[in-house]
Interface confidence: low
Amino acid sequence: KKEDGESTAPTPRPKILRCKCHHHCPEDSVNNICSTDGYCFTMIEEDDSGMPVVTSGCLGLEGSDFQCRDTPIPHQRRSIECCTERNECNKDLHPTLPPLKNRDFVDGPIHHK
C-alpha cells in the first residue's frame, strides 16, 4: 500500500539517466554504467555465425528515435527495446529475436517498454 504523502503520479524520468551497459560501454563508464540524456536500451541480434548476442547501453536523445523503433538493415534479425522510466531500467528489458523477414525494412515500430 502507498504510504501517506507518497505520490501516485508517475515519476518523471531523470534528466540524466544511468543505464547498464554491456558490449556498448563508453570509455568513461564505471562499473558497466553509462549516462545519457536519452534512453537505456537492450538489444538482441544475430552475429555473423547466427548466434544471438545481447548488448545494452545508452542511447542519446538525438538519434534514438529510429534506434528504438526500426531495423534499418535488410533481412537482419535484430530487436531493440528502450526505456526511460528509471535508472538502469534496461536490466528488465528482454527483447527476443523477430522472425525472419523477406523485405527491405520494417515499417512497424519496435516496442518501447
Epitope: 536500451f41 545508452c58 534514438s64 534499418p72 518501447h112
Partner: antibody, heavy 116, light 113 residues
Framework: QVTLKESGPGILQPSQTLSLTCSFS??????????VGWIRQPSGKGLEWLAH???????SYNPALKSRLTISKDTSNNQVFLKIASVVTADTATYYC????????WGQGTLVTVSA | DIVMSQSPSSLAVSVGEKVTMSCKSS????????????LAWYQQKPGQSPKLLIY???TRESGVPDRFTGSGSGTDFTLTISSVKAEDLAVYYC?????????FGAGTKLELK
C-alpha cells in the same frame, strides 16, 4: 557546437560515380544512437532523402535509388561518405548531410552538376 | 512509402497576418506506444539549408520563435505562424520520420502580397 560540411566534385559526366564527403565536428559517430543522413535538392525543387548511417554501421537507403547508393563512414576522422553510381543529369542537385533522425543540424550543401 | 502532401503550394501574405499551412500523410504518424507523432517541420530560406522548426509535430526546436506552432495528430498536421514577419518568407517543408524511406512534403512557399 555541431557543424557539418559537404564536399563533392562540382561537375561530373553522365555514367560516372559521384563521391560525396560529409565532414563534421561537435558530434561523434561512435556515440551510441548517433546517425547522419544525406538529402538532396534539385534547384527550385523539394527535398529528397537518400541514405542514413548509424553509429553501429546500420544503413538505410531510399528504395528508389538503392541500387546506385552506397553510404559509409570513417568514425575516427568524423566523416560520412555517399557514392552514387551511374549518374544522370537528373542527379544534378544540392546535396546536404544532416545529423540525427529528425535533421536538427544541416551542412551548407554542395552543388553537383551532371553534364555531358 | 508514406506520401506527404502539403497545401497550399504557395501562400501570399501580409506582414502581421496569421498563416496556417497543412501537411497530410498517407498513413498515421502516431506511434501508440509513446503517443508521439513522428513529424517535423523545416523552414528553408533562399540560398540556405533547411532549418528544423518543429519536431514530434508540436515541439518547438530550441531558439525557434514562439510565433511558430505545430499541431495535429495521426495524418493531419498544421503549421501556424501567429503573426508573419518579413524574415519568415521562405519555403516550409514537413517530413515524416515514422518509417523508411523518410519522406518530405513538396513544400509551401510563403510570399509577400
Amino acid at each position: 557546437q555541431v557543424t557539418l560540411k559537404e564536399s563533392g566534385p562540382g561537375i561530373l559526366q553522365p555514367s560516372q560515380t559521384l563521391s560525396l564527403t560529409c565532414s563534421f565536428s561537435g558530434l561523434s559517430l561512435s556515440t551510441p544512437g548517433m546517425s547522419v543522413g544525406w538529402i538532396r535538392q534539385p534547384s527550385g525543387k523539394g527535398l529528397e532523402w537518400l541514405a542514413h548511417i548509424w553509429w553501429n554501421d546500420d544503413k538505410s537507403y531510399n528504395p528508389a535509388l538503392k541500387s546506385r547508393l552506397t553510404i559509409s563512414k570513417d568514425t575516427s576522422n568524423n566523416q560520412v561518405f555517399l557514392k552514387i553510381a551511374s549518374v544522370v543529369t537528373a542527379d544534378t542537385a544540392t546535396y546536404y548531410c544532416a545529423r540525427g533522425d529528425r535533421f536538427a543540424y544541416w551542412g551548407q550543401g554542395t552543388l553537383v552538376t551532371v553534364s555531358a | 512509402d508514406i506520401v506527404m502532401s502539403q497545401s497550399p503550394s504557395s501562400l501570399a501574405v501580409s506582414v502581421g497576418e496569421k498563416v496556417t499551412m497543412s501537411c497530410k500523410s498517407s498513413q498515421s504518424l502516431l506511434y501508440s506506444n509513446n503517443q508521439k507523432n513522428y513529424l517535423a517541420w523545416y523552414q528553408q530560406k533562399p540560398g540556405q539549408s533547411p532549418k528544423l522548426l518543429i519536431y514530434w509535430a508540436s515541439t518547438r526546436e530550441s531558439g525557434v520563435p514562439d510565433r511558430f506552432t505545430g499541431s495535429g495528430s495521426g495524418t493531419d498536421f498544421t503549421l501556424t505562424i501567429s503573426s508573419v514577419k518579413a524574415e519568415d518568407l521562405a519555403v516550409y517543408y514537413c517530413q515524416q520520420y515514422y518509417s523508411f524511406p523518410l519522406t518530405f512534403g513538396a513544400g509551401t512557399k510563403l510570399e509577400l502580397k
